[in-house]
């Protein structure tokens, strides 16, 4: 999906009002210095591409983020403010089918959500030069 035509300011507002709080809740009990940010993005469409990938694509050690509240709200925001996004399919089917009934937050998931927080912060500051 090409995120170029999204309403970035509306997505930013949704992040600031709700999604950011859900990310903080997920990370509660974790020190902000515990994980190094290794994923970066260069502009808003690129940031949304990386955010979608980390939020919805299962990774080794963390296959369970898609049903977290921050993930569902991210999906809703993209569906409302990115034309045609609701037509795209997310390839999380197998991981979702295999997920445990009991919620398990692994260290790998915490690291992934920490990366997401960094990507969202970068999304919110598009005029900053990349380090």
């Amino acid at each position: 999906y090409d995120f170029t035509n999204c309403d970035f300011e509306k997505i930013k507002a949704a992040y600031l009002s709700t999604i950011s709080k859900d990310l903080i809740t997920y990370m509660s009990g974790t020190k902000s210095t515990e994980f190094n940010n290794t994923v970066s993005c260069s502009n808003r469409p690129h940031c949304l591409t990386e955010i979608q990938s980390l939020t919805f694509n299962p990774t080794a050690g963390c296959a369970s983020l898609a049903k977290e509240m921050f993930a569902m709200k991210t999906k809703a925001a993209l569906a409302i403010w990115c034309p045609g996004y609701s037509e795209t399919q997310i390839n999380a089917t197998q991981a979702m089918k295999k997920r445990r009934k009991r919620k398990v937050t692994t260290n790998k998931c915490l690291e992934q959500v920490s990366q997401l927080q960094g990507l969202w912060r970068r999304f919110n500051r598009p005029l900053l030069k990349q380090q």
């Epitope: 709200k73 809703a76 609701s86 997310i90 999380a92 979702m96």
Partner: nanobody, 118 residues
Framework: EVQLVESGGGLVQPGGSLRLSCAAS????????MCWFRQAPGKEREGVSC????????YYADSVKGRFTISADNSKNTAYLQMNSLKPEDTAVYYC???????????WGQGTLVTVSS
């Protein structure tokens, strides 16, 4: 199999109101996102509004903000879209959608037609 069933569509005059309902079967409703989309003839489907059944957060497209109100009744497993000050350009098939329990994709209702015309 989870199902979403919309109702409440119909013909209404410009400036009028309608209330759409979306009844969900199964346990899809709890702590989920429920959204309304619409598709006008010859146009792409567009997102109208979403609500988190977990905390009640809502999102609205600019085209409907201030006129439409989304809500959810968790005890009835039903989401609503109250549509006021309807305009001819609101004419479309309205679809309810929820986040799937078994994949990262949407579960869709069958749609309900809203026609705004005098």
């Amino acid at each position: 199999e989870v199902q979403l069933v919309e109702s409440g569509g119909g013909l209404v005059q410009p400036g009028g109101s309608l209330r759409l309902s979306c009844a969900a079967s199964g346990n899809i409703f709890t702590r989920n996102i429920m959204c309304w989309f619409r598709q006008a003839p010859g146009k792409e489907r567009e997102g109208v509004s979403c609500i988190s059944t977990g905390d009640g957060s809502t999102y609205y497209a600019d085209s409907v903000k201030g006129r439409f109100t989304i809500s959810a009744d968790n005890s009835k497993n039903t989401a609503y879209l109250q549509m006021n000050s309807l305009k001819p350009e609101d004419t479309a098939v309205y679809y309810c959608a929820a986040d799937s329990e078994t994949s990262g994709n949407w579960v869709w209702g069958q749609g309900t037609l809203v026609t705004v015309s005098s």
